[in-house]
């Protein structure tokens, strides 16, 4: 049953709650069989996903999976938003679900939002 389709394992309605000023690695888990596809990150601006050029990215290899990583060094308040990775494979584009970064600006926040708060924010975002 194992297919050789490229898979990007980012779940629908996934999110990360992070703080401005911290380093952060946004991972796109990539499954492929023979040749590793070319993978890129983009940031959603409305319905358009704007390709992130000139950003620090890297690959991490694990047993049966590779991770294409977008580095935030450090996280900025403007990094708040939704991101998507896409793979170019055999002239086809495979797109992931979007994953949302909720950036808390340490200057204006006294405490980290709870997981329930994040979930309800996401529910509003996707409903």
């Amino acid at each position: 049953k194992e297919s050789c389709d490229v898979q990007l394992y980012i779940k629908r309605q996934s999110y990360h709650s992070i703080f401005a000023g911290d380093p952060f690695k946004l991972e796109c888990p990539v499954k492929y069989c023979a040749h590793r596809p070319q993978v890129t990150w983009c940031k959603l601006n409305g319905t358009t996903c704007v390709k992130l050029e000139g950003r620090h990215t890297s690959w991490k290899q694990e047993k049966n999976l590779s991770f294409f990583i977008l580095h935030f060094e450090p996280v900025l308040p403007s990094d708040n938003g939704s991101y998507r990775c896409s793979a170019n494979f055999l002239s086809a584009i495979i797109e992931s679900h979007s994953t949302t970064l909720y950036v808390t600006d340490v200057k204006s926040a006294s405490e980290r939002p709870s997981k329930d708060e994040m979930a309800s924010r996401l529910w509003l975002l996707y409903s």
Epitope: K1, Q7, L8, R12, K31, I93, I94, E95, H97
Partner: antibody, heavy 121, light 112 residues
Framework: QVTLKESGPGILQPSQTLSLTCSFS??????????VSWIRQPSGKGLEWLAH???????RFNPSLKSRLSISKDTSNNQVFLKITTVDTADTATYYC?????????????WGQGTTLTVSS | DVVMTQSPLTLSVTIGQPASISCKST???????????LNWLLQRPGQSPKSLIY???KLDSGVPDRFTGSGSGTDFTLKISRVEAEDLGVYYC?????????FGGGTKLEIK
Amino acid sequence: QVTLKESGPGILQPSQTLSLTCSFSGFSLSTFGMGVSWIRQPSGKGLEWLAHIYWDDDKRFNPSLKSRLSISKDTSNNQVFLKITTVDTADTATYYCARGNWDGETYFDYWGQGTTLTVSS
Amino acid sequence: DVVMTQSPLTLSVTIGQPASISCKSTQSLLDSDGKTYLNWLLQRPGQSPKSLIYLVSKLDSGVPDRFTGSGSGTDFTLKISRVEAEDLGVYYCWQGTHFPWTFGGGTKLEIK
């Protein structure tokens, strides 16, 4: 060979808590892309999705029941658990667990045989 | 929630003849990743559901090629080119594009 098998109490009284176990083999819930859902079916009626747990312990719930549901997993023993609090006669149904396979997102490619719950006073 | 409506409710077919089931959703099932998460299941009498088709038209393993799925957006169809006795049961479409995942009410296929 992938198999899933549900087990539960069979009969409960209203206001009790339902605890269900899904024991599976043939795959690992630590593998990227894998997940398990719970779905129920009142006798002679259609299917209702309840909850899903992903490989990384991320969870999704049907909002109509979310306040009463909890889902968890024991990866090393190949088990997934569902709890429904304060059951009522409307929760009488056959409860299925199903493997969520990944092709860009989940679809249910294998189902258990189901376990029947009757809620009666 | 996305409501899935199937028609007909019951389908009575002679063995060897074709059959067609319609499934309509109240919202488009085309996801932002370009895929359409519309799936079909068969529940034979007294059994648990079995996966037939996922992503509109991909046949699950072991499913005979007399089954075909088609459609886009909000309108989908399951076709059986030549019905066999083992095909009787209730067919369900379900969507995995929007949470909560939802199922159609089912179409009962009877053998004439």
